[in-house]
Interface confidence: low
């Protein structure tokens, strides 16, 4: 029997216009078989990923995918820049596309920009 | 093939720590978690806790938390696990396991026994 | 933490008969569509051998006398037909959810 390879599907350059001050949701989405991986997200720091050890996380579980969510609560200026999240299973380090997260300051906003909520599939694969 | 070299059996007083070495050889070290296993004589199995040897990150059981000491060096392919502040139950069977695509527990060492006595 | 429970605790089964192993989940260890229980058999003197992944698919070499089946939280393992060599303990695993939890094992004896 073959072995179930982990894959997260992240849009290739995904961005995501936020408010600082509200909550947000930053979704990994990751399908898996046999056993759940360990997956962690990271913010981009340069050329390096730094790992979020102390962020809320936590899983969505849906019939054909899961998602593997960061918390913001809330979203803070210091937030706007690129994540990526990591997927340790096994055989496999698997990364993914990063995903940008542009935060308007509340105070400068004077109207709230539309976020892309990654609802287009099917997802650009990366393995 | 994927193959483990567990150290061997040690026998400490209690109150004091082991240093157990699981040596792995077969495949790249650095891609495969390595769970550590406890058993005790003549009965189940306990998830100590496992630890990925590319970036050192772990999980434990909180049962062990503070306790378990996972480690991993790279250079010579081996994990190591340290448990300190021994007690009788801690006399047991430690094994290594490494997973592969389908489950956590595919290869085993032959296990290292710990005995705590005074 | 999630608990297994084995049964029984012992088992003696006539040679080409078929055992029947019992493993309950304290709670649902399904998810994704998977159920997340291994089986593992236990010589003495020996580590435990991987038999059955996920509930119902066999390991690498294992032979297709060992078969597992269930969901949710009630799973078991079949043996059929018994030969010598399979007198050993037989231990469930869930990897649902950290920490990862093992059943108490049953001890198989060929009669």
């Known amino acids: 029997k073959e072995s179930c390879d982990v894959q997260l599907y992240i849009k290739r350059q995904s961005e995501h216009s936020i408010l600082a001050g509200d909550p947000f949701e930053l979704e990994c989405p990751v399908k898996y078989c046999a056993n759940r991986p360990h997956v962690t997200w990271c913010k981009l720091n340069g050329t390096t990923c730094v790992k979020l050890e102390d962020r809320q996380t936590s899983w969505k579980e849906e019939k054909n995918i899961s998602f593997f969510i960061l918390h913001f609560e809330p979203v803070l200026p210091n937030d706007n820049g690129s994540y990526r999240c990591s997927a340790n299973f096994q055989s496999n380090l698997i990364e993914s596309h990063s995903t940008t997260l542009y935060v308007t300051d509340v105070k400068s906003a004077s109207e709230r920009p539309s976020k892309d909520e990654m609802a287009s599939r099917p997802w650009l694969l990366y393995r | 093939q994927v193959q483990f070299q567990q150290s061997g059996a040690e026998l400490a007083r209690p109150g004091a720590s082991v240093k157990l070495s699981c040596k792995a050889s077969?495949?790249?070290?650095?891609?495969?978690?390595i769970q550590w296993v406890k058993q005790r004589p003549g009965q189940g199995l306990e998830w100590i806790g496992t630890i990925y040897p590319g970036d050192g990150d772990t999980r434990e059981n909180q049962k062990f938390k503070g306790r378990a000491t996972l480690t991993a060096d790279k250079s010579s392919s081996t994990a190591y696990m340290q448990l300190s502040s021994l007690e009788s139950d801690d006399s047991a069977v430690y094994y290594c396991?490494?997973?592969?695509?389908?489950?956590?527990?595919?290869?085993w060492g032959q296990g290292t026994l710990v005995t705590v006595s005074a | 933490d999630i608990v297994l429970t084995q049964s029984p605790a012992s088992l003696a089964v006539s040679l080409g008969q078929r055992a029947t192993f019992s493993c309950r989940a304290s709670e649902s260890v399904d998810d994704y569509g998977i159920s997340f229980i291994n089986w593992f058999q236990q010589k003495p003197g020996q580590p435990p051998k991987l038999l059955i992944y996920a509930a119902s698919n066999q390991g690498s070499g294992v032979p297709a006398r060992f078969s597992g089946s269930g969901s949710g939280t009630d799973f078991s393992l079949n043996i059929h037909p018994l030969e010598e060599d399979d007198t050993a303990m037989y231990f469930c695993l869930q990897s649902r959810e950290i920490p990862y939890t093992f059943g108490g094992g049953t001890k198989l004896e060929i009669k």
């Open positions: 077969g495949y790249t070290f650095t891609d495969f978690w």
């Open positions: 396991a490494r997973g592969n695509g389908n489950s956590w527990f595919a290869y």
